[in-house]
């Protein structure tokens, strides 16, 4: 059975995260897609989503936060920048497609952001612009700013599972292990 | 004991396909992501493609898209890469290589299947 | 595509020598670059990633250093077993693409 997976990734400040999210590209390559945080009895709030539709690795910067899609491969990468100990939270991903419900994408990452620095090569760099290069960019449209409340419970239901296999069944299993993630500041 | 274990070596004539199979063990085969890379005799190493084991999703290099599939049996933890439309320039050995985590951005290859060897040849 | 450019492609060194192989990007890809080693017949072996970490496992003689788009792998000492081909490769955005080789031969 496909699973719902939750990945822990321990930070300290001023580091950066960098993850993906992968998808069926032949159903949702264009499809608008954003990064959510989930607080505990809330509904997932939208913090940056791609352009729609969606460019291929086009980076999208919003504050901290940049995304780029890469269409052709089936991966949104998520770079969250200098961060901070209130980043810390649970995150996913998931593709807007109106008039449905938005589609959660593998996996969640449950962040852990620590006061302290670390001594890693490149770490004192804490310039989101200097180190990447991208010039701020704003999305053509808004974020949508409805989300599903079904995404709030700990269970999710089977619908958002991965669409070439719609009848498994979905756990949400806690990964114990962390990762810890070398700092590219 | 972690590895990665590919099937037999292969001959098939052009216009075939072939089915690269890739059997894991002694980790949890859904959490790191599964890439193919391939090397033709006396050249580099050449990227073709990832799959996340977990979710079956994959993506391919511009070059194999529309002749590469890649899926895998959660079951049995095998991996599969199947090449279609062969060519002579297809002759190479195909790789499995485990990369990170499968929410990881971090690509880099830390076990390595032994090679499966396809020659393609009239 | 970012373009991994490696060089020497071919050097040849006496065991005891310390060598160093150069990996340079197109275009700045940071720290997103490993290193591997591939033996005839073998397949390749991750020795360093993230350009300076050392993966478990790995000799000390190994090290990498570099960020943006030049990158160095050096053996301090030289040993029997390291004759090999070395390969550098990014990840800093898709297509992840990897260098020529360097071959790196008894003298």
């Known amino acids: 059975a496909t699973k719902l997976t939750e990945e822990k990734y321990e930070l300290k400040e001023g580091q950066t995260l960098d993850v993906k999210c992968d998808y069926t590209l032949e159903k949702f390559a264009s499809s608008q897609k954003a990064w959510q945080i989930i607080r505990d009895g809330e509904m997932p709030k939208t913090l940056a989503c791609t352009e729609r539709p969606s460019k291929n690795s086009h980076p999208v910067q919003v504050g901290r936060i940049i995304l780029e899609d890469y269409h052709d491969h089936g991966l949104l990468r998520v770079r969250m920048v200098n961060l901070q100990v209130e980043d810390s939270g649970l995150y996913q991903c998931v593709i807007y497609q109106p008039p449905k419900e938005p589609h959660m994408l593998f996996d969640r990452i449950r962040l852990v952001v620590t006061k302290g620095f670390s001594g890693t090569p490149g770490s004192n760099e804490n310039s989101t612009q200097n180190v990447y290069k991208i010039p701020p960019t704003t999305t053509k449209a808004l974020c949508p700013l409805y989300t599903s409340p079904r995404t709030v419970t700990q269970a999710p239901p089977k619908s958002t599972a991965d669409v070439s296999t719609p009848d498994s069944e979905i756990n949400l299993t806690n990964v114990t292990d962390i990762i810890r993630v070398p700092v590219f500041n | 004991q972690v590895q990665l274990v590919q099937s037999g070596a292969e001959v098939k004539k052009p216009g075939a396909s072939v089915k690269v199979s890739c059997k894991a063990s002694g980790y949890t085969f859904t959490r790191y992501d599964i890439n193919w890379v391939r090397q033709a005799t006396g050249q580099g190493l050449e990227w073709m493609g990832w799959?996340?084991?977990?979710?079956?999703?994959?993506g391919s290099v511009q070059k194999f898209r529309g002749r590469v599939t890649m899926t895998r049996d959660t079951s049995i933890h095998i991996a599969y890469m199947e090449l279609s439309s062969l060519r002579s320039e297809d002759t190479a050995v195909y790789y499995c290589?485990?990369?990170?985590?499968?929410?990881?951005?971090?690509?880099?290859?830390?076990?390595w299947g032994r090679g499966t060897l396809v020659t393609v040849s009239s | 595509d970012i373009q991994m450019t490696q060089s020497p492609s071919s050097l040849s060194a006496s065991v005891g020598d310390r060598v160093t192989i150069t990996c340079q990007a197109s275009?700045?890809?940071?720290?997103?670059l490993n290193w591997y080693q591939q033996k005839p017949g073998k397949a390749p072996k991750l020795l360093i990633y993230d350009a300076a970490n050392l993966e478990t496992g790995v000799p000390s003689r190994f090290s990498g250093s570099g960020s943006g788009t030049d990158f160095t792998f050096t053996i301090s000492s030289l040993q029997p077993e390291d004759f090999a081909t070395y390969y550098c490769q990014h990840y800093a955005n898709l297509p992840i693409t990897f260098g020529q080789g360097t071959r790196l031969e008894i003298k």
């Open positions: 799959m996340n084991p977990n979710s079956g999703n994959s």
């Open positions: 290589a485990r990369g990170g985590y499968t929410s990881s951005w971090r690509h880099y290859f830390d076990l």
């Open positions: 275009q700045d890809i940071r720290k997103h």
